[in-house]
């Protein structure tokens, strides 16, 4: 048998094959050691037993989407059943004192590798055997402490295939340079040692996407914006774009990455360097907003420029190639791909990436004052608690609730916190009472909000003793 | 000077469906949060829902809540209270009052009984 | 049951001080306003105080309102036969997210 035959169904063409060529990865036209590593269909029997206690489910990730050029990394990761987990020398024990439906079990191991192979290596001091290969025969790696590596991962994507041994989690990174763009499929089988031979305990698999658009989102935060997600932010304060580039392999660490945006209320383009950008709207509506992010990407070379005429000016050395038609496959772009030319074959290409949000601008309270304090006399006995007025101004829209969290001096330990609806007039003034429970000094977050917006003002303030003769002070 | 007057009373059956209407003058509608509440013949006063004068918040008795949706047109100066799945308990004078942290005006109240 | 606590009924005779107990808790009476509210016999109900102690225009002096704790009274001087009425106090509650009555205090004018 063949790796195709064994690891998917999915056929990549001949140009595909010959075009996706993934480095350190072998065609899945070798031969697979079907003695060595038995291949079950889905369905076969001998799944149900080929683990003690229960099924394994292997969990495959990666970071997808990539830039075209950049590093993909898949992890995948082995849940075992109930009361079920790796040592540190590799051996699958039951957790102490977990019960599963076999209750608690008398032997602490599920696997006890170790014991195994110590019992069955009986080979030549080189530590090698037959039957420590990989299902192409390859010897494994004899990396330290490589024998309390029980699992046996076999990646295929792309008509290759990739072996790893590890232990109940692994990771693998692949560069997208010869990828084709769009969307492909990984596949992972997993193997366990059993004995001399091994046998399949999971398969998955995974879609991820390789692409030349650089994959960008933007977080937006404005002050006393109520809900940050729901793309309504206020009238006449900033707001904080921040754009995050999807790059965990830092392919575009050494990019001078250029951001251009439109706010969709005629302000114009705005270029900048900065990955945040403060923007304040001016008018209420919905507006359209858009971002393209550009960064000079390692990429490939275009072919050398023909020898110069000595009729003809020399040409540029920055040639322009027009992209690939979106129908072929094989690294395509939107955009003419910009290539410039640079004496050592290191190339740049010009990657483009894109935003776009609906936003809807609102009336909202934009600033909150407190610009009184009042003790409140109240009629005795009720020696051991003050009441305060606090007048309170605002600007913006009409708030309609108002929260006063009362805390220690440092403003960390909340002690008290009463939310109630407001009526307030067009004037913004009001006046919010609350109970303060003995003298001392306090902390005093008073809150307005409305449907969309939340503002806040912090005072220090200082009770005194129920002595009429001792004022209220603004400790602050 | 400040009316509101309440309509949409009457005669339902358990299980129906009534809608209340709040028409309101001498005030500037659409600055001022809304409120419901109700009294059973011979008792106490029962506070029902209260509106923000955006209608992007709405707070509801726990008697009410998910029957009752209380909501307003701005252009026509009218709070409404949607009553579904009524209950004989449902039985009261439902007045419409303005503002929501003191009821400073009352309408004259609509009744609304809930009988087989 | 009310989650404020007011009693049934209260009586005076014409040009005597009443007051009415108010009793709550600090979700509601004790950090929030209170108002008092009238309702004489088969009419609407009429704010009476706001505030704590609050009077609106066209409720006469004879009126007040005051708040100690987590309670809060009304008193009614010069008592007159008009005077004759329900009387409620309410505030909203911070922990029950609602706003909320006294059972009502049945006054009556001996």
């Known amino acids: 048998k063949r790796f195709h035959d064994v690891l998917g169904n999915e056929r990549p063409s001949a140009y595909m094959r010959e075009h996706n060529q993934l480095n350190g990865w072998s065609s899945d036209e070798n031969d697979w050691n079907e003695k060595l590593y038995p291949v079950w269909k889905r369905g076969d029997m001998r799944w149900k037993n080929s683990w003690k206690g229960g099924r394994v489910q292997a969990v495959l990730t990666s970071d997808s989407p990539a830039l075209v050029g950049s590093n993909i990394t898949f992890a995948v990761n082995l849940i075992f059943p109930r009361c079920q987990k790796e040592d540190a020398n590799g051996n699958i024990v039951y957790e102490k004192n977990c019960r599963n439906e076999a209750g608690l079990s008398a032997d602490p191991y599920v696997y006890n590798w170790t014991a195994w192979s110590e019992d069955s290596d009986g080979e030549n001091g080189t530590g090698q055997s037959h039957h420590n290969v990989f299902p192409d025969g390859k010897p494994f790696p004899h990396h330290p402490g490589w024998r309390r590596w029980n699992f046996i991962y076999v990646f295929h994507t792309l008509g290759q295939y990739f072996q790893k041994l590890g232990r109940c989690s692994v990771r693998v990174s692949v560069n997208t340079a010869n990828v084709t763009l769009g969307p492909q499929l990984m596949e992972v089988t997993v193997y366990r040692r059993h004995g001399r031979a091994y046998v399949p305990i999971a398969q998955v698999k995974d879609v991820y996407v390789v692409t030349d658009q650089i994959p960008v989102f933007v977080t937006m935060f404005q002050k006393n914006d109520r809900n940050s997600s729901d793309e309504t932010f206020l009238k006449d304060l900033p707001i904080m774009f921040d754009v995050l580039i999807h790059d965990p392999s830092h392919f575009l660490n050494y990019s001078t990455i250029n951001y251009k945006w439109s706010f969709g209320d005629n302000t114009g383009l705005f270029v900048s360097t900065n990955h945040t950008v403060n923007h304040t709207y001016v008018l209420n509506g919905t507006f359209s907003l858009n971002l393209t992010v550009k960064a000079a990407a390692p990429g490939p070379c275009p072919p050398p420029p023909p020898p110069p005429r000595p009729s003809k000016p020399t040409p540029s050395l920055a040639t322009t190639l027009k992209s690939y038609d979106s129908n072929t496959p094989g690294p395509a772009g939107d955009n003419p791909l910009e290539l410039s030319r640079i004496p050592d074959e290191n190339c740049q290409i010009n990657r483009y990436g894109h935003f776009q949000a609906t936003i809807t601008i609102v009336e909202g309270i934009l600033e909150v004052n407190i610009i009184q304090m009042t003790d409140v006399l109240m009629p005795v006995p009720w020696p051991e608690s003050s009441l305060i007025d606090f007048v309170v101004t605002c600007q913006g829209s009409i708030p309609t609730e108002v929260c006063t969290i009362i805390s220690d001096p440092t403003c960390e330990i909340t002690q008290n916190t009463v939310c109630s609806p407001v009526d307030v007039d067009e004037m913004c003034l009001l006046t919010v009472r609350r109970t303060f429970n003995g003298s001392g000094t306090y902390c005093v977050n008073l809150t307005l909000g409305d449907d969309t917006s939340l503002a806040l003002t912090s005072t220090l303030i200082s009770v005194p003793d129920r002595d009429p003769a001792s004022p209220l002070r603004m400790a602050n | 000077e400040v009316q509101l007057l309440e309509s949409g009373g009457g005669l339902v059956q358990p299980g129906g469906s009534l809608r209340l209407s709040c028409a309101a003058s001498?005030?500037?509608?659409?600055?001022?949060?809304m409120s419901w509440v109700r009294q059973a013949p011979g008792k106490g006063l029962e506070w029902v829902s209260s509106?923000?004068?955006?209608?992007?918040?709405?707070y509801y008795a726990d008697s009410v809540k998910g029957r009752f949706t209380i909501s307003r047109d701005n252009s026509k100066n009218t709070l409404y209270l949607q009553m579904n799945s009524l209950r004989a308990e449902d039985t009261a004078v439902y007045y419409c009052?303005?503002?929501?942290?003191?009821?400073?005006?009352w309408g004259q109240g609509t009744l609304v009984t809930v009988s087989s | 049951q009310s989650v404020l606590t007011q009693p049934p009924s209260a009586s005076g005779t014409p040009g005597q001080r009443v007051t009415i107990s108010c009793s709550g808790s600090?979700?509601?009476?004790?950090?929030?306003?209170v108002s008092w509210y009238q309702q004489l016999p088969g009419t609407a109900p009429k704010l009476l105080i706001y505030?704590?102690?609050q009077r609106p225009s066209g409720v006469p002096d004879r009126f007040s309102g005051s708040k100690s704790g987590t309670s809060a009274s009304l008193a009614i001087s010069g008592l007159r036969s008009e005077d004759e009425a329900d009387y409620y106090c309410?505030?909203?509650?911070?922990?029950?997210?609602?706003?909320?009555f006294g059972g009502g205090t049945k006054l009556t004018v001996l």
């Open positions: 009052a303005r503002k929501w942290s003191t009821f400073d005006y």
């Open positions: 001498g005030f500037t509608f659409r600055k001022l949060n």
């Open positions: 509106i923000s004068h955006s209608g992007g918040s709405k």
């Open positions: 600090s979700s509601n009476i004790g950090n929030n306003y």
């Open positions: 505030a704590d102690s």
């Open positions: 309410g505030a909203w509650d911070s922990s029950l997210n609602a706003y909320v």
